[in-house]
């Protein structure tokens, strides 16, 4: 504006860039860039790239909204994933195959390896690759609760689609519970929504990782895309740092 | 601060107050305070106070989070309420009383009087006064869709409670649909959540406005607190103003 | 050779002028600015003789308020007691003691600054920083500040002792 | 909204989101972030006029509140409104880590 | 968080939410708003330091980013974070109206 000092756009950009330098290190709780002396040669492992891409895809699907950010949320979250126990595991034998449900079990020791303390977990998502779907389907997600009871978690109305699509359910609270408990294997159930009157309660949707009789190489690809838990958590060493700096700035 | 110009807190407060003067008028699209020459003597009508209190209660229960605010959301919204058609209306006869559901119907002419155009509606909430509840109950809300079909909208897990409590369901999309269509009476159904296995599907929760055999005076109070739609909408005259200033600042 | 300077007149602006070279170009920068690492831009030099505010620490919740002095150079601040240097709450943290950056800013160590006006055998002479003159009212409240080489001493009245954290003379609690 | 769609295609002088791509190597001299190579950080810039709302109100001035001082601040400021996170891959020792950094990308701005 | 709980009970000089009650009659000279009589509008005030992050990083300085410049702005500014709406009752002619005004009450602030 005529009466103001002209804005030096280059200076503003430089200050923004310098602030980002500090911000990234600060979010990672690093005092300086990490030493790269031990980095092995060659490209990133496939699994790491897959995890990075999952996270990036999640971001693209997220609404860009500012959330009031508690202190713990300011800091970076490590992203890991835990694949569902494969369907040939004996745990699945206990649950009778039904037309209205599929079951997904997870090894809690793998979860604990990724997230040693329940309080460190900031988000857990159950990711399912749904294959093409001919008709609209209303599905419900349940958590295995006690011996033979299931607790309702959430539901989703799936529109018909010709292409596969990742479904994501927020299961943070459930996974936090699992980390606090002693169980070895915990699980989810995906069911057709059953109305009190209706009798047609078949689960029409085909979830990757459950169909059988595939060719060997396809089965491997298929297995990699089986349901998994995407976990975002504060690394343990960063959390200890956080606790020690609890006092107000 | 010691080296900077001292902040004149009084000046800041005065500027904030003056900005609020403009902000309120601007949000109401008023060029100056409205004339008070026609205001009738005496206190505000009971119904208006009740509506004001409903709105205030809603605010208190809302999380204080900034939402990215589209232009239309900046402006004030008029709040009205439309009560459910009373249960002795013949419309209810068509729907057999069942142990797992209750029905709520609304007169769309009343809705249109409150909100002449679907686009003006910014929020609609279905408010139900739930009476005390002995056991946890999982309920589902459905919208009357066609002759005898119902479309699932949402669900709620109700915790046991000794005191009555207002339940609120966001039904903005549904009411917007109703305002676009020609129907005279539209409705909701509140049902117990029915699992595919379970057979005990009774709706345990007691919703105000449905119990019968009350003493006359109690029935009236009871009737006032029957389910209603709380509507927030841009007044028509303000909306016309909005359309004419669609171009970017 | 492509003359990048005439091709893009905005190169090196707003704080320098473009000079064409064979196959490339460099920026000749205005006073107070220095070429960037690739010599394709100009950035402000934080000259040691610029005078700004000296901040005492970053522990305080109101560190913008913990100003030791208002008119000191980066060397006078960071080579003595300061934790940060700048103005209007825009702060350059002082380099950590014993780091390469600290030695570059304070080649003569804590408590000393270089005086470019006095040159002995072609090398700028070092002079002691007089903390009492620069920061006296802030670092020795209720006491008498005496400059030493390097550093300073704060003498308190009888019945008071010097608190190195508060930087003031505090009543001995008997 | 003062978002990338509007601001990147206009010459808006008031508060708006401005384009800024950060290349970790070129701009920060960092090679330690393996993915991504950089990102569109963007930033908010531009004045938010403070309008003294005298009692001689009139629509022209009041209409400006919506964009220039919707929060009725005593000193409105151009700040981020919608933000997005950024996932990165880097090594700690020999172990690659995927981490997500919250609120790193500015998608839109507002006067606040 | 820089919210009413923390800020109203501290002497924080940096960015914080400050108490401000607006009485429609006394402060604005308005009698036309019938409910409420006034409200706690509050406001944000206080500096947000900009820290030049030299490559001589160290934890003490980096820890300050969280509060003082979490968005890595070139000129961080103290602005509202959490806001709440305000319902009011006023008359248009003889008709009482209940209207809700969005984002009127400042509950917390942030450097942005």
């Amino acid at each position: 504006l005529s009466t103001c000092k002209t804005i030096d756009m280059e200076l503003v950009k430089r200050k923004r860039i310098e602030a980002i330098r500090g911000q990234i290190l600060s979010k990672l709780r690093l005092a300086s860039p990490p030493s790269q002396g031990e980095v092995p040669p060659g490209p990133l492992p496939e699994a790491v790239l897959a995890l990075y891409n999952s996270t990036r895809d999640r971001v693209a699907g997220e609404s860009a909204e500012p959330e009031p950010e508690p202190e713990a949320d300011y800091y970076a979250k490590e992203v890991t994933r835990v694949l569902m126990v494969e369907t040939h595991n004996e745990i699945y034998d206990k649950f009778k195959q039904s037309t209205h449900s599929i079951y997904m079990f997870f090894n809690t020791s793998e979860l604990r390896e990724a997230v040693p303390e329940p309080v460190l977990l900031s988000r857990a998502e159950l990711r399912l690759l749904r294959l093409k779907l001919k008709v609209e389907q209303h599905v419900e997600l349940y958590q295995k609760y006690s011996n033979n009871s299931w607790r309702y978690l959430s539901n989703r109305l799936l529109a018909p689609s010709d292409s596969p699509e990742w479904l994501s359910f927020d299961v943070t609270g459930v996974v936090r519970q699992w980390l606090s408990r002693g169980g070895e294997i915990e699980g989810f159930r995906l069911s057709a929504h059953c109305s009190c009157d209706s009798r047609d309660n078949t689960l029409q949707v085909d979830i990757n990782g459950f169909t059988t009789g595939r060719r060997g190489d396809l089965a491997t690809i298929h297995g990699m895309n089986r349901p998994f838990l995407l976990l975002m958590a504060t690394p343990l060493e960063r959390a200890q740092h956080l606790q020690s700096s609890r006092h107000r700035r | 601060l010691s080296t900077c110009k001292t902040i004149d807190m009084e000046l800041v407060k005065r500027k904030r107050i003056e900005a609020i003067r403009g902000q309120i008028l601007s949000k109401l699209r008023l060029a100056s305070p409205p004339s008070q020459g026609e205001v009738p003597p005496g206190p505000l009508p009971e119904a208006v106070l009740a509506l004001y209190n409903s709105t205030r209660d809603r605010v208190a229960g809302e999380s204080a989070e900034p939402e990215p605010e589209p232009e239309a959301d900046y402006y004030a919204k008029e709040v009205t309420r439309v009560l459910m058609v009373e249960t002795h209306n013949e419309i209810y006869d068509k729907f057999k009383q069942s142990t797992h559901s209750i029905y709520m119907f609304f007169n769309t002419s009343e809705l249109r009087e409150a909100v002449p155009e679907p686009v003006l509606l910014s929020r609609a909430e279905l408010r139900l006064l739930r009476l005390k509840l002995k056991v946890e109950q999982h309920v589902e809300l459905y919208q009357k869709y066609s002759n005898n079909s119902w479309r699932y909208l949402s669900n709620r897990l109700l915790a046991p409670s000794d005191s009555p409590e207002w339940l609120s369901f966001d039904v903005t999309g549904v009411v917007r649909q109703w305002l676009s269509r020609g129907g005279e009476i539209e409705g909701f159904r509140l049902s117990a959540h029915c699992s595919c296995d379970s057979r005990d599907n009774t709706l345990q929760v007691d919703i105000n406005g449905f119990t019968t055999g009350r003493r006359g005076d109690l029935a009236t109070i009871h009737g006032m607190n029957r389910p209603f739609l709380l509507l927030m909408a841009t007044p028509l005259e303000r909306a016309q103003h909005l359309q004419s200033s669609r171009h970017r600042r | 050779d492509i003359d990048e300077c005439s091709q893009d007149p905005s190169l090196c602006l707003p704080h320098g002028a473009c000079k064409n070279l064979q196959g490339s170009y460099v920026c000749v920068c205005d006073e107070g600015f220095t070429p960037t690492q690739d010599q394709h831009g100009c950035e402000e030099v934080e000259q040691p003789h610029h005078k700004k505010e000296c901040y005492l620490n970053f522990d305080d919740t109101v560190f913008c308020d913990s100003v030791l002095a208002t008119n000191v150079t980066q060397q006078e601040c960071c080579c003595s007691l300061g934790a940060g240097w700048g103005d209007h709450c825009e702060i350059y943290p002082c380099p950590v003691y014993s780091s390469a950056e600290f030695h570059s800013l304070c080649p003569d160590g804590k408590g000393y600054t270089q005086d470019n006006n006095i040159v002995n055998y072609g090398i700028p002479a070092h002079r002691d920083i007089d903390e009492c003159m620069l920061f006296g009212s802030e670092i020795c409240k209720e006491g008498k500040c005496v400059n030493t080489q390097p550093g300073y001493e704060c003498y308190c009245k009888q019945g008071f002792y010097y608190d190195g954290n508060l930087l003031e003379c505090v009543d001995v609690d008997e | 909204a003062l978002d990338t769609n509007y601001c990147f295609s206009s010459t808006e002088k008031n508060c708006c989101v401005r384009q800024l791509y950060i290349d970790f190597r070129k701009d920060l001299g960092w090679k330690w972030i393996h993915e991504p190579k950089g990102y569109h950080a963007n930033f908010c810039l531009g004045p938010c006029p403070y309008i003294w709302s005298l009692d001689t109100q009139y629509s022209k001035v009041l209409a400006l509140y919506n964009q220039h001082n919707p929060g009725a601040s005593a000193a409105p400021c151009c700040v981020p409104q919608a933000l997005e996170p950024l996932p990165i891959v880097y090594y700690v020792g020999r172990k690659p880590k995927v981490e997500q950094l919250s609120n790193m990308i500015v998608r839109s701005c507002k006067c606040s | 968080a820089l919210d009413t709980n923390y800020c109203f009970s501290s002497t924080e000089k940096n960015c914080c939410v400050r108490q401000l009650y607006i009485d429609f009659r006394k402060d604005l000279g308005w009698k036309w708003i019938h409910e409420p009589k006034g409200y706690h509008a509050n406001f944000c005030l206080g500096p947000c330091p900009y820290i030049w992050s030299l490559d001589t990083q160290y934890s003490k300085v980096l820890a300050l980013y969280n509060q003082h410049n979490p968005g890595a702005s070139a000129a961080p500014c103290c602005v509202p974070q959490a806001l709440e709406p305000l319902p009011i009752v006023y008359y248009v002619g003889r008709k009482p109206k209940v209207e809700q005004l969005s984002n009127m009450i400042v509950r917390s602030c942030k450097c942005s």
């Epitope: 002396g37 031990e38 980095v39 490209p43 | - | - | - | -």
Partner: antibody, heavy 119, light 107 residues
Framework: EVQLLESGGGLVQPGGSLRLSCAAS????????MTWVRQAPGKGLEWVSA????????YYADSVKGRFTISRDNSKNTLYLQMNSLRAEDTAVYYC????????????WGQGTLVTVSS | DIQMTQSPSSLSASVGDRVTITCRAS??????LNWYQQKPGKAPKLLIY???SLQSGVPSRFSGSGSGTDFTLTISSLQPEDFATYYC?????????FGQGTKVEIK
């Protein structure tokens, strides 16, 4: 300023041994992997060996595997190449270089030291 | 081991010319390719890393492109100080291999 200075080269008989050193300064030595590259007279560059920042991981070209040993002393900021069972084809200028952070490009090089294997 | 093949092995050019050197890998190496310049009697100098990133302090007339197996180093306008030998090197996996070099001479 980053500086690398090789030493220890010279004339040695086939089957003999030699130990090359590379003194580093101007950067935090332990934070970087280091490498040796050689160049036979009038020929191109040939990568010889590399070592991670802590010294925990080593890498060798097939042509020197089992005969050469790379090591480092981070307290002395020094890189070493122990060459045993030397052959005539090992005659070359040996360069030590710093491995740029994690990407395995070699961003700073020493001036080289000549090793001649001849009877 | 991954073989790196440079072409041409030598070329003659004049000051101001645009010069292109290519490098081919025996298998895909993504973008893990670096270019070096070496003058007689001197140590090599890093010009380009990760196929296209310009090393700090290197003039902008040097540029790199390509990914997978085929890569190119381009000097947009040859300067007197650019007459030297240029090597490509893969950093995809150990052993790290260099191309045989391309000598750029004055025409």
């Amino acid at each position: 300023e980053v500086q690398l200075l090789e030493s220890g080269g010279g004339l040695v008989q086939p089957g003999g041994s030699l130990r090359l050193s590379c003194a580093a300064s101007g950067f935090t030595f332990a934070d970087y992997a280091m490498t040796w590259v050689r160049q036979a007279p009038g020929k191109g560059l040939e990568w010889v060996s590399a070592i991670s920042g802590t010294g925990a991981h080593t890498y060798y070209a097939d042509s020197v595997k089992g005969r050469f040993t790379i090591s480092r002393d981070n307290s002395k900021n020094t890189l070493y190449l122990q060459m045993n069972s030397l052959r005539a084809e090992d005659t070359a200028v040996y360069y030590c270089a710093r491995v740029s952070s994690g990407h395995w490009d070699f961003d700073y090089w020493g001036q080289g030291t000549l090793v001649t294997v001849s009877s | 081991d991954i073989q790196m093949t440079q072409s041409p092995s030598s070329l003659s050019a004049s000051v101001g010319d645009r010069v292109t050197i290519t490098c081919r890998a025996s298998q895909s190496i993504s973008s893990y390719l670096n270019w070096y310049q070496q003058k007689p009697g001197k140590a090599p100098k890093l010009l380009i890393y990760d196929a296209s990133s310009l090393q700090s302090g290197v003039p902008s007339r040097f540029s790199g492109s390509g990914s997978g197996t085929d890569f190119t180093l381009t000097i947009s306008s040859l300067q007197p100080e650019d007459f030297a030998t240029y090597y490509c090197q893969q950093s995809y996996s150990a052993p790290f291999t260099f191309g045989q070099g391309t000598k750029v001479e004055i025409k």
